[in-house]
Interface confidence: low
């Protein structure tokens, strides 16, 4: 059942979102979620996952990219991108990082 909390060993992850109580959290896995709401700049949230592991397998879209990993602080320096929306003939540019 994907809604059941994971019972495996916990990992320590970087926590960086408005919901964080401190710089790290502990969970079944670490997450980075990049979300862009209509008309807003993207927001990148780092934290811990315990539920809905199936989200980790989702493909990036132009609005969301969900990354998961399983080792100590593995989400600390991950930088995500959203799926490009330009026509296939155009090549996406780089952004300097």
């Amino acid at each position: 059942d994907p809604v059941k909390p994971s019972r495996g060993p916990l990992v320590t992850c970087t926590c960086e979102s408005p919901h964080c109580k401190g710089p790290t959290c502990r969970g079944a896995w670490c997450t980075v979620v990049l979300v862009r709401e209509e008309g807003r700049h993207p927001q990148e949230h780092r934290g811990c996952g315990n539920l809905h592991r199936e989200l980790c397998r989702g493909r990036p879209t132009e609005f969301v990219n969900h990354y998961c990993c399983d080792s100590h602080l593995c989400n600390h320096n991950v930088s995500l991108v959203l799926e490009a929306t330009q026509p296939p003939s155009e090549q996406p540019g780089t952004d300097g990082q």
């Epitope: 970087t14 960086e16 990049l34 807003r40 993207p42 927001q43 949230h45 780092r46 600390h76 990082q97």
Partner: nanobody, 126 residues
Framework: QVQLVESGGGLVQAGGSLRLSCAAS????????MAWFRQIPGKEREFVSG????????DYADSVKGRFTISRDNAKRAVYLQMNSLKPEDTAVYYC???????????????????WGQGTLVTVSS
Amino acid sequence: QVQLVESGGGLVQAGGSLRLSCAASGLTGNYYVMAWFRQIPGKEREFVSGISWSGNRADYADSVKGRFTISRDNAKRAVYLQMNSLKPEDTAVYYCASSAPGWDMLRRNSRDYSYWGQGTLVTVSS
């Protein structure tokens, strides 16, 4: 209206230290990436260091890694750059920059930053 004001620049001998400060006003909330860039006349503005909005993550240009340290104090709406072991090639005008609200990703491209200070001159003599 957003205003970024840098201070702490000056003349220092090679090997010395300086601490730059940037005071931000007009920013609502803390969800801004802050960064330092530098520029010498006739050259493009160059990324020095950036810090995520929680202060959890920092990024440094290779040329300053191990010598410079970025930090921020969200209560004071300030970002700092501690510069140690300064070299003559660090001479430049140093600019503080802030992302648009909600832009949480550390970036090295100046185009990703919406607000800029007027700059403070750092001169390192040999």
